[in-house]
Amino acid sequence: EQVKHSETYCMFQDKKYRVGERWHPYLEPYGLVYCVNCICSENGNVLCSRVRCPNVHCLSPVHIPHLCCPRCPDSLPPVNNKVTSKSCEYNGTTYQHGELFVAEGLFQNRQPNQCTQCSCSEGNVYCGLKTCPKLTCAFPVSVPDSCCRVCRGDGELSWEHSDGDIFRQPANREARHSYHRSHYDPPPSRQAGGLSRFPGARSHRGALMDSQQASGTIVQIVINNKHKHGQVCVSNGKTYSHGESWHPNLRAFGIVECVLCTCNVTKQECKKIHCPNRYPCKYPQKIDGKCCKVCPGKKAKELPGQSFDNKGYFCGEETMPVYESVFMEDGETTRKIALETERPPQVEVHVWTIRKGILQHFHIEKISKRMFEELPHFKLVTRTTLSQWKIFTEGEAQISQMCSSRVCRTELEDLVKVLYLERSEKGHC
C-alpha cells in the first residue's frame, strides 16, 4: 500500500527532513558544504548531488562564502543580504569561517603519515585526521589549505583529480571530495594460490555518505569554542577520540578482553565480543590477551594490513574471501564484487555497470561455488567479516541510487575499502 506523503520523511545525520525539503549537508571537517544540494525524495531517501556551476563570463569572478558558484562582480547580491558567518578562536588564534588550519596534539593515535586538519565553520572548529599521500620528492613543500606537504609542481594538492569533484568551501577554501586512492599492484588471481600484495591500509569504516568525504579522514572531533578540549571519551583516565576502540580496564578484573568499547563522539559504547561456536580445529586454545580461543599450529597467512586468527578469524569473527573483477569495453565498465560464504556454500556477486560515470545497471546474483570456480578474471582482494559486508551492502544501496542520477567516479572503489579489515593494534581487537 502507498505510504502517505505526510508520514514519509528522511533521516540525515540524525535530523528529520520533510519530503521535498532541500538543504546543504554539514560535512566534517568542512562544515556546511554549499556545493552540495540534498533533497528528501518521496520514498524517504536522501539524494545529494554536486552543484554544477555555470561558466562565468568575466575576468575576475568573486567567491561569496555562503554561495557555491563564483559570480561576476556586477551580479552580486546587495551588501545588506550578506550572511555574516561566525569566526572561531582556537589556541589563541582567530580563524575566519571556512578557513582551514593545522592543529597539533589532538589525536593520540595519529600515524606518522597523518596530520590533523581543522576548519572553522559557523563558529565551531572541526578537526579530522588526514592520511597524506606518499611523497615522491626529497623536498616537499607546505601549502596553505592542507596539513599535508606536497611535492612542488603537484598542483595545489597531490591527490588524484576527479573532474567536477571539488567542494568549494566558503572563503575560497577548497577540499576534494574523494578519498586518497592508494596505488597498488593488482593482487594475484584466485587460481594462483598465494596471497601476496593487497591494497594498503583501509581507514574507512561504515557507509560512505555522511562524513567520510575527505581524503583519508578517519575520525572527526568537534572543538567547541567555549570548551577548548575536544569531544572525546575518557575511560579509566585515558582519552579516546571519536571512533577509537579499546578494551575496558576494570579495577577488579584488569583488562576485559571480551568487551570492546568504542568512542562515539563523547559517549562510550561497549559491547561483548561473541566468539565462534564452531572452530576449524578440534582443540582451540585460550591465549592471554585474546578474548576468543584460537586454533594452535601454523599462523594463517597474513594479508598486509590485516590480522587473522588461524583459519581466517578476525577479532573472533569469521572471515570470508572477497573477489573482484573489473571489465571494460566500449566505454562501459562492469565491476563485480563477490563474497564467498560457507553457510550456505555459495558466492554472492554484486554487479555494477557504469558508463561515463553514471550507473547503468546494478544487480545481485547468487551462484554456487562450483559455478564461481568456472569464472575467470576474479581476483582475491581481501577477506572480510559479515558485519563489514553488511556495512558495504548498506552503503552500496545508497550509492546505487545516487550514482544512477549523477556522475560517480570513485564512490564504488571507495566503498570497497570498507571490506578491508584493520590490523588489530598490539594484538587487541
Epitope: F327, T334, Q346, H363, E365, K366, I367, S368, M371
Partner: antibody, heavy 120, light 107 residues
C-alpha cells in the same frame, strides 16, 4: 548486429570425428563466453561446455569431457567444437550460444541457428 | 545435479488468454533462472533471465516470477506468434540444467 553462423548439416560415419564451427560477428568476440548446447528430439537441451575466447580457457559438463573439445580462432572470430568417437547417440542439433556479459550466471542471449549432426 | 521439473508438458490457449508455465528446482537456485522460447525449426531465444528480468526486445506480455525452488513464467495475453516450446534453465550451479519443455499451442 550480433550473429553466430553455423553450418546447417553434417553427416558422418560412426567412430569418426567432426569439427563444428561457429563464426561470430557484430561484437567483440574475445569479450563473451561461447557455449555449446546439444538438443536431441525428446531429450531436451544440455550444455556441453564453454570457452573463454580471450585465453582459450574451457569448462566442460562432466558428461561430455571425453566427447567434446572446444577451441577458438581469434583471428577469424570462430569457435569450434570437435566431437570424437561418434555414435548414433551423438546425432542431434548442436548450438553455439553467447552468454550475457554483465551477469555471472550463464544466460544465453544469442544463439547460432544450429548444426544438425547425423551419425549414420 | 539440480533437476528442473517443468509443467505442464503441453497446453493450448486461445488468443488473449493468460498462460502460466511453472518450473520447480530440486534445490534453492536463488533466482538464477532463465526462460527460453523455441519456435519450430529455430534456435531458442532468451525471454527472461535472473527469474524476472525481461530481455531487450521481448514483448512486455511476458513476465517471470518466483523464488527459492518455485518459478513461473506468465504470458499475459496469448498471441498466435507465441506458439512455441518454452524451456526453463537453472544457472545457479554447474552443470546447467534445463526443464523438459512446455509445448504451447493455439486453441
Amino acid at each position: 548486429q550480433v550473429q553466430l553462423q553455423q553450418r546447417g548439416t553434417e553427416l558422418v560415419k560412426p567412430g569418426a570425428s567432426v569439427k563444428l564451427s561457429c563464426k561470430a560477428s557484430g561484437y567483440t568476440f574475445t569479450s563473451y563466453w561461447m557455449h555449446w548446447v546439444k538438443q536431441r528430439p525428446g531429450q531436451g537441451l544440455e550444455r556441453i561446455g564453454n570457452i573463454n575466447p580471450s585465453n582459450g580457457g574451457t569448462n566442460y559438463n562432466e558428461k561430455f569431457k571425453s566427447k567434446a573439445t572446444l577451441t577458438v580462432d581469434k583471428s577469424s572470430s570462430t569457435a569450434y567444437m570437435q566431437l570424437s568417437s561418434l555414435t548414433s547417440e551423438d546425432s542431434a542439433v548442436y548450438y553455439c550460444a553467447r552468454s550475457k556479459n554483465n551477469y555471472v550466471a550463464y544466460y544465453f542471449d544469442y544463439w547460432g541457428q544450429g548444426t544438425t549432426l547425423t551419425v549414420s | 545435479d539440480i533437476q528442473m521439473t517443468q509443467s505442464p508438458a503441453s497446453l493450448a490457449a486461445s488468443v488473449g488468454e493468460t498462460v502460466t508455465i511453472t518450473c520447480r528446482a530440486s534445490e534453492n537456485i536463488y533466482y538464477s533462472l532463465a526462460w527460453y522460447q523455441q519456435k519450430q525449426g529455430k534456435s531458442p531465444q532468451l525471454l527472461i533471465y535472473n527469474a524476472n528480468s525481461l530481455e531487450d526486445g521481448v514483448p512486455s506480455r511476458f513476465s517471470g516470477s518466483g523464488s527459492g525452488t518455485q518459478y513461473s513464467m506468465k504470458i499475459n495475453s496469448m498471441q498466435p506468434e507465441d506458439t512455441a516450446t518454452y524451456f526453463c534453465k537453472q544457472a545457479y550451479d554447474v552443470p546447467l540444467t534445463f526443464g523438459a519443455g512446455t509445448k504451447l499451442e493455439l486453441k
